[in-house]
């Protein structure tokens, strides 16, 4: 199984290393998740030709995946630390149902899919500690999530492959934008 950040052999071998700051820990956690996504994408791309499809073609989907927009305060123009942090946490919470969908979608990378899901939960906890304005964070409705999950799982094979690919790509892009913004905070 993939080893979570802070538990690799290098860390064990260097007990006198300075403990990671909150920001460093978040940075490392996101990079760990990105590595996991990369491994999952490898399996997906080997299995189907979705990865060759153009971004424009893939944009024509009815998935409501979280995406960074200018108004979210995470880009340089209009950068706003608090607004951005709320968007990152809200977006990650919204991705959780899609990460649940990814479970059982992988044959050789089953553990990796679980690791991405669990690491994201940990990341959300790290970020919630960093956020001052937790009241502004809306948690997705569990009933809505349950029916969405059922709907996604009822799709035909081709659509499930497409959905898997889109979730991985969108989650990667969301994490990249999030981490770039967090590196400015």
């Amino acid at each position: 199984a993939p080893v979570p950040p802070g538990e690799d052999s290098k860390d064990v071998a260097a007990p006198h290393r300075q403990p990671l700051t909150s920001s460093e820990r978040i940075d490392k956690q996101i990079r760990y998740i990105l590595d996991g996504i990369s491994a999952l994408r490898k399996e997906t791309c080997n299995k189907s030709n979705m990865c060759e499809s153009s971004k424009e073609a893939l944009a024509e989907n009815n998935l409501n995946l979280p995406k960074m927009a200018e108004k979210d305060g995470c880009f340089q123009s209009g950068f706003n630390e608090e607004t951005c942090l709320v968007k990152i946490i809200t977006g990650l919470l919204e991705f959780e149902v899609y990460l649940e969908y990814l479970q059982n979608r992988f044959e050789s990378s089953e553990e990796q899919a679980r690791a991405v899901q669990m690491s994201t939960k940990v990341l959300i906890q790290f970020l919630q500690k960093k956020a001052k304005n937790l009241d502004a964070i809306t948690t997705p409705d569990p009933t809505t999530n349950a029916s969405l999950l059922t709907k996604l799982q009822a799709q035909n094979q081709w659509l499930q492959d497409m959905t898997t690919h889109l979730i991985l790509r969108s989650f990667k892009e969301f994490l990249q934008s999030s981490l770039r913004a967090l590196r400015q905070m």
Partner: nanobody, 124 residues
Amino acid sequence: EVQLVESGGGLVQPGGSLQLSCTTSGRRFSEYAVGWFRQAPGKEREFVADIGEQAENTWYAHSVLGRFTISRDDAKNTVYLQMDSLKPEDTAVYYCAADKYGVGGNAQGYYDSWGQGTQVTVSS
């Protein structure tokens, strides 16, 4: 790691323009974020601009904001730094760097590959 090669540097008058290029033969270069840094004689290396795997995610140092533009052409495995309204204080060796996570950032530690640099001199 990817091998990076910068080009396009030279001598230019104040107010002039230059376009720097950062190229690699790396197959997955489109997945990397690329940053430009610069180092003037006797000074620390400093962040100039970066571009994420998603080309719309660009950041600039305040000193170059509005004058420099970073862009990428993934078909050519190249990232460009268009430098306009150049000032004598822009004189430096310019380095490009790549981040395999596609994120980038304003600190050198975020990057895992570096080019050798290209000299830019702004003088009349």
